[in-house]
């Protein structure tokens, strides 16, 4: 077939796909153009296996990413269960356009959040010492709405400072006790959640949250002092 | 250093009502979790209530619905309203506070003890 003579804009160049916790966004670098005073602009199309392509705007997804200056669509950004369903196969196209202009389109290898996420680490994490014991609660890195489908466990992995690490899960709660510890000792800890996804028999290892260190009580039958 | 400076407490009859509260003061960076525990005469010591930053709350099973803890983060500060008291509650009060004081190379949570104060219901 002869070239599209309106084809004659440069394509966007090294887009990338950021998939972390429930985030969704593709990025690229500016089409600069020298001899040009209107800006380029760029629109962004979707697909999943079997469908047509979208245009990714207002009323397909949620987001408008069609005729925008932005170098950047976040399909998360009206709200963290926006965006694309985790489980499904979804194929991202962009191309930049000025007037009647535009790019040949750029088309991504395609996607399943589940299946291609940076997990972060578990958020909030806090600790309540006991005798010997520690009990730490946090949240999940991000939401799941049908857990069925996927879930988290969760590993901690602690060690008494100064001494060799252990690693305790995997457990589903978002709470759990460390037993069997010295009274009236430091411990750090560092907890890691991990994606399983049911489908496909895939599981996401999640980065570690930062080491915090924290001091088991004494001995409760020993008498209380400041 | 840090200091946990309680107030409240006394001699109250069966039924009644009691408020404690607890400052913390020094080189804090952060506190987390807040909370009570008590000691009777010859028992081991026992938690009564415990706040974190998040608003997580554990209240030892003898005391839920009578008593209710609450904290002011800006002023490092914990109290414990004690309602329809028993005597069983009779108890030395320990304020707790698990603190960060910024000095190690990781957060590092210690624990700090108020001075401890005599709560008796008595009629």
């Known amino acids: 077939a002869p070239p599209d003579p309106l084809s004659q804009l440069p394509a966007p160049q090294h887009p990338k796909i950021r998939l972390y916790n429930a985030e969704q966004v593709l990025s690229w670098e500016p089409v600069a153009l020298s001899n040009s005073t209107r800006p380029v602009v760029y629109q962004v199309q979707f697909k999943y296996t079997d469908s047509k392509w979208f245009t990714a705007d207002i009323m397909s997804i949620g987001v408008n990413c069609t005729q925008i200056t932005a170098t950047e669509c976040d399909f998360t950004a009206a709200s963290p269960s926006a965006g694309f369903p985790m489980d499904f196969n979804v194929t991202l196209r962009l191309r930049a356009e000025l007037g009647a202009l535009h790019s040949a389109w750029v088309t991504m290898p395609w996607f399943q959040h589940y299946r291609n996420v940076t997990v972060g680490p578990p958020e909030n994490i806090e600790v309540t010492p006991g005798e010997g014991s520690l009990i730490i609660r946090f949240s999940s890195p991000f939401d799941i709405a049908d857990t069925s489908t996927a879930f988290f466990c969760y590993y901690v992995h602690y060690w008494e400072k100064g001494g060799i690490q252990q690693v305790k899960g995997p457990f589903r709660s978002n709470s759990i006790s460390l037993d069997n510890l010295k009274p009236s000792r430091v411990y750090c800890l560092q907890v890691q959640a991990q994606l399983l996804w049911n489908k496909s028999n895939i599981f996401r290892v999640g980065h570690l949250s930062n080491i915090s260190c924290y001091e088991t009580m004494a001995d409760a039958s020993t008498e209380l002092q400041q | 250093q840090v200091q946990l400076q309680q107030f409240g407490g006394g001699l109250v009859q069966p039924g009644g009502s009691l408020t404690l509260s607890c400052a913390a003061s020094g080189s804090i960076f952060s506190i987390n979790p807040m909370g009570w525990y008590r000691q009777a005469p010859g028992k081991r010591r026992e938690l009564v209530a415990s706040?974190?930053?998040?608003?997580?709350?554990t209240y030892a099973d003898s005391v839920k619905g009578r008593f209710t803890i609450s904290r002011d983060n800006a002023k490092n500060t914990v109290y414990l309203q004690m309602n329809a008291l028993k005597p069983e509650d009779t108890a030395v009060y320990y304020c707790?506070?698990?603190?960060?004081?910024?000095?190690?190379?990781?957060?590092?949570?210690?624990?700090?003890w108020g001075q401890g104060t005599l709560v008796t219901v008595s009629s």
């Open positions: 706040l974190t930053n998040r608003g997580i709350t």
């Open positions: 707790h506070a698990y603190v960060d004081t910024g000095s190690h190379e990781y957060p590092q949570y210690e624990n700090y």
